[in-house]
């Protein structure tokens, strides 16, 4: 039969005051029959911490259900940790005996010491927006942790990033430490809905890392593409010209029409739609009166997006003599 091993995987467990500490202990065999107890310290002066009776130790709960027949996990959780709880904890197997149980085997022990949790990571993006294909920097900061060892990872939409630099300060001994990391992210045109995540893992977090996020929508500017087209159908003596502004972000946009260089003040119909990737499309319709037009009408659709330099597209209106002479009998 397999010899019983008492496994306490952590040599050191760092916990914060007021929080809950998990002390792990698993056994490799169900034999011999008998309970597993927890003690702090060794020798005759050791202190019983847990004896499978909550009434004796109200701050202690178990991770697994000890009533299950094949249970081999005797890990415990101690709530509301105070400085008085520090010390080395041992899980100890007893063999059922008469008149009393006999100590059979002890685990190697886990030292519980006080640490400090890192603060929630704060992720900051660039001050100004940047267009796709360019690189932007994001910073992540977390403070107040102890001990100094800490792991920081960056993700973009769940994919781990590798282009980042991290510093932990101070370099020498301190009561608490801070971490600052800067990640470089190449923007893609579809990144309006993307997120960068900074993940911080620390021994005091008991396997549950802290995360800070930033939306790339705050950092990206997707410039629009413009297309001006003339509708083949005439409405009476008017021709409909369409300016399609496609795939832009953010929504901030000013559109103006010019006729032969003169800015048109009159109202135009328009629609704004949102694409699946978070970018927008804007369509503007402009009705040109052709009853008294010369042949050389040039229409310009000018777009100023997010405070950038205006871009424009021109269209030389094609108005046939036949169209001009036609009586305006079409219903508007």
């Amino acid at each position: 039969e397999e010899e019983l091993q008492m496994i306490q995987p952590e040599k050191l467990l760092l916990v914060t005051v007021g929080k809950t500490a998990t002390l792990h202990c698993t056994v490799t065999s169900l034999l011999p029959v008998g309970p597993v107890l927890w003690f702090r310290g060794v020798g005759p002066g050791r202190e019983l911490i847990y004896n499978q009776k909550e009434g004796h130790f109200p701050r202690v709960t178990t991770v697994s259900d000890l009533t299950k027949r094949n249970n081999m996990d005797f890990s415990i959780r101690i709530s509301s940790i105070t400085p008085a709880d520090v010390g080395t904890y041992y899980c100890v197997k007893f063999r059922k005996g008469s008149p009393e149980n006999v100590e059979f085997k002890s685990g190697p022990g886990t030292e519980m010491a006080l640490g400090a949790k890192p603060s929630a990571p704060v992720v900051l993006g660039p001050a100004a927006r940047t267009t796709p294909e360019h690189t932007v920097s994001f910073t992540c900061e977390s403070h107040g942790f102890s001990p100094r060892d800490i792991t920081l990872k960056w993700f973009k939409n769940g994919n781990e990033l590798s282009d980042f630099q991290t510093n932990v300060d101070p370099t020498g001994q301190s009561v608490a430490y801070s971490i600052r990391s800067t990640a470089r992210v190449v923007l893609d045109p579809w990144d309006v809905r993307s997120q960068v995540i900074c993940e911080v893992a620390h021994v005091t977090l008991q396997g549950d890392p802290l995360r800070g996020t930033a939306n790339l929508s705050e950092a990206i500017r997707v410039p629009p593409t413009l297309e001006v087209t003339q509708q083949p159908m005439r409405v009476g003596n008017q021709v409909n010209v369409t300016c399609q502004v496609r795939k832009f972000y953010p929504q901030s946009l000013q559109l103006t029409w010019s006729e032969n260089g003169n800015v048109c003040q009159r109202e135009t119909a328009s629609t704004l739609t949102e694409n699946k990737d978070g970018t927008y499309n804007w369509t503007s319709w402009f009705l040109v009166n052709i009853s008294d037009q010369r042949d050389d009408v040039v229409l310009t659709c000018q777009v100023k997006h997010d405070g950038q330099l205006a871009v424009s597209k021109r269209l030389a209106l094609e108005v046939t003599v036949h169209q001009k002479d036609q009586s305006s009998d079409a219903t508007p």
């Epitope: 009434g55 202690v60 259900d65 000890l66």
Partner: antibody, heavy 119, light 111 residues
Framework: QVQLQQSGAELVRPGVSVKVSCKGS????????MHWVKQSHPKSLEWIGV????????YYNQNFKGKATMTVDKSSSTAYMELARLTSEDSAIYYC????????????WGQGTLVTVSA | NIVLTQSPASLAVSLGQRATISCRAS??????????MHWYQQKPGQPPKLLIY???NLESGIPARFSGSGSRTDFTLTINPVEADDVATYYC?????????FGGGTKLEIK
């Protein structure tokens, strides 16, 4: 079967104290700690604290320190909670609750004791 | 303290339909692969009754119509199909950190 029997409703004047009891039966009383929970509107359910029934060591929610005092009488398998200097804010239903084994959820509850503080 | 926010505050569901109640924690209630989130049902004039423990484990004697899911900060209690006897207020509770805290409750009614 496990039963937690609580004392009856109390109508008390502001400024006085009240002591609510909870008698455990159907199990070994000192094997399980006793928790106390307050239910009032609009604050939903609030954990007051827990007392070890064997040694009588009590641990309180910070919000109830100085307000609630938990004690046990092993001989009668009864847990007590005294509420001091009562105000209208203390008007609520108070429950005692017990966990299953050394689990971390409340498997058994008393029927509740309604405490009404009124002049 | 960990704050638990339940939504909706109340919901009306037709008999035989699915009811979904959400509970969001102000910080993660997971530790070493366990989710320390539990669900209770409370009917008028009665104490709370345990339905689900550790996010997804059905308490003994509770019908399989009740199920729980979720991890870290987002948890869900699902009742499918809803029966007339399910009219009650449902509470989530975390035990990852002291003090244990409860959600504000969700009142379930029949349409």
């Amino acid at each position: 079967q496990v039963q937690l029997q609580q004392s009856g409703a109390e109508l008390v004047r502001p400024g006085v104290s009240v002591k609510v009891s909870c008698k455990g039966s159907g199990y070994t009383f000192t094997d399980y700690a006793m928790h106390w929970v307050k239910q009032s509107h609009p604050k939903s359910l609030e954990w007051i604290g827990v007392i070890g029934t064997y040694y009588g060591d009590a641990y309180y929610n910070q919000n109830f320190k100085g307000k609630a005092t938990m004690t046990v009488d092993k001989s009668s398998s009864t847990a007590y909670m005294e509420l001091a200097r009562l105000t209208s804010e203390d008007s609520a239903i108070y429950y005692c609750a017990r966990r299953a084994g050394t689990s971390d959820w409340f498997a058994y509850w008393g029927q509740g004791t309604l405490v009404t503080v009124s002049a | 303290n960990i704050v638990l926010t339940q939504s909706p505050a109340s919901l009306a569901v037709s008999l035989g339909q699915r009811a979904t109640i959400s509970c969001r924690a102000s910080e993660s209630v997971d530790s070493y692969g366990n989710s320390f989130m539990h669900w209770y049902q409370q009917k008028p004039g009665q104490p709370p009754k345990l339905l689900i423990y550790r996010a997804s484990n059905l308490e003994s004697g509770i019908p399989a119509r009740f199920s729980g899911s979720g991890s870290r900060t987002d948890f869900t209690l699902t009742i499918n199909p809803v029966e007339a006897d399910d009219v009650a207020t449902y509470y989530c509770q975390q035990s990852n950190e002291d003090p244990p805290t409860f959600g504000g409750g969700t009142k379930l009614e029949i349409k």
